[in-house]
């Protein structure tokens, strides 16, 4: 079968990398630079993807696969195949449209992107905070006051990284 | 707020230049990531990309124009230059200056316009 | 260069109807599409960008959807104000082409 097409089809031989030119009779040429096939029998190259500005270049264009973009320092990558950058926050603090600010009281982040996330409430759980949470950490929760039996020593907490808050109970 | 104003714009001869300022106000040209260009449009037609510069000095030019186009800056002033020279008459056209991407998310599309500045190049 | 080919070039409607105004890339582009909207004698103003992101202040009627080759713009109920011209744009790469516009008139 695949001799017969090639007898019908002789764009079928073109392997990914090079285009079936009509303009030379239907053999195959390597794609131009700036250009790939990813796929065997293609009669163009497509034009590759161009990381510039704020976009910058994770992986180059080959003849056979395409570029790829990732965001350059200070910004991460959005929607599909990185279509946009958006800048990046510190912990503790949040994107809005004014910029950057800080997690409101009893909120957190700890990453340089999202939204700042309400604290766990332990209570909820039955549990205790064993450790305060802070705008870029979440509280941890310890077992409930039950759960300790008398007399068995209770866990000292270790000192809260910055601006120690209270999980809500 | 994010202004762009344009100036130089005129009557120029034909085989003369053009020189066209875009005055950037609300945000620094220096500002990481940020990208301004320059679009133009024919009178009744559609819009022509003629190229960017970025905060790292890149510059990116449309190849129709790369020839005779020059795009500098000028970050003291916060200016933004178009130069474009050997003008001939289908260079006839209102000049926008533009900034890329919007407050904090950024790409490749234009979300502020100067108000342009019309170019006529006859003799 | 990527061309962008509009549909229709010219449309007429009344207010309230529902529009649509398609472009066509000459090659997959993935999302990297814009939309603008551009009134007589005044700058072009964004719409959509990367082909769906509302930009901040625009109205929610108008939306935009699609990936690789075919991109749409809706407008959900045309207003008085709607009546203009409208432009997609890639950025997949350079030279950043438009398309050659689709002009809503009154009907």
């Known amino acids: 079968f695949e001799r017969t097409r090639s007898l019908q089809d002789p764009c079928s031989n073109c392997p990914a990398g090079t285009f079936c030119d009509n303009n030379r009779n239907q053999i195959c040429s390597p794609c131009p630079p700036n250009s790939f096939s990813s796929a065997g029998g293609q009669r163009t190259c497509d034009i590759c993807r161009q990381c510039k500005g704020v976009f910058r270049t994770r992986k180059e264009c080959s003849s056979t696969s395409n570029a790829e973009c990732d965001c350059t320092p200070g910004f991460h990558c959005l929607g599909a195949g990185c279509s946009m950058c958006e800048q990046d926050c510190k912990q503790g603090q949040e994107l809005t449209k004014k910029g950057c600010k800080d997690c409101c009281f009893g909120t957190f982040n700890d990453q340089k992107r999202g939204i700042c996330r309400p604290w766990t409430n332990c209570s909820l759980d039955g549990k205790s905070v064993l450790v305060n949470g802070t705008k870029e950490r979440d509280v941890v929760c310890g077992p409930s006051p039950a759960d300790l039996s008398p007399g068995a020593s209770s866990v000292t907490p270790p000192a809260p990284a910055r601006e120690p808050g209270h999980s809500p109970q | 707020e994010v202004q762009l104003v344009e100036s130089g714009g005129g009557l120029v001869q034909p085989g003369g230049s053009l020189r066209l300022s875009c005055a950037a106000s609300?945000?620094?040209?220096?500002?990481?990531?940020?990208?301004v260009g320059w679009i133009r449009q024919a009178p009744g037609k559609g819009l022509e990309w003629i190229g960017d510069i970025y905060h790292s000095g890149s510059t990116y030019y449309n190849p129709s124009l790369k020839s005779r186009v020059t795009i500098s800056r000028d970050n003291s002033k916060n200016t933004l230059y178009l130069q474009l020279n050997s003008l001939r008459a289908e260079d006839t056209a209102v000049y926008y200056c533009?900034?890329?991407?919007?407050?904090?998310?950024?790409?490749?599309?234009?979300?502020?316009w100067g108000q342009g500045t019309l170019v006529t190049v006859s003799s | 260069d990527i061309q962008l080919t509009q549909s229709p070039s010219s449309l007429s409607a009344s207010v309230g109807d529902r529009v649509t105004i398609t472009c066509r890339a000459s090659q997959s582009i993935s999302s990297y599409l814009n939309w603008y909207q551009q009134k007589p004698g005044k700058a072009p103003k964004l719409l959509i960008y990367a082909a769906s992101t509302l930009q901040s202040g625009v109205p929610s009627r108008f939306s935009g959807s699609g990936s690789g080759t075919d991109f749409t713009l809706t407008i959900s109920s045309l207003q008085p104000e709607d009546f203009a011209t409208y432009y997609c744009q890639q950025y997949y790469s350079t030279p950043l082409t438009f398309g050659q516009g689709t002009k809503v008139e009154i009907k």
């Open positions: 609300g945000f620094s040209l220096s500002t990481s990531g940020v990208g």
């Open positions: 533009a900034r890329e991407g919007s407050t904090a998310v950024l790409g490749d599309w234009f979300a502020y």
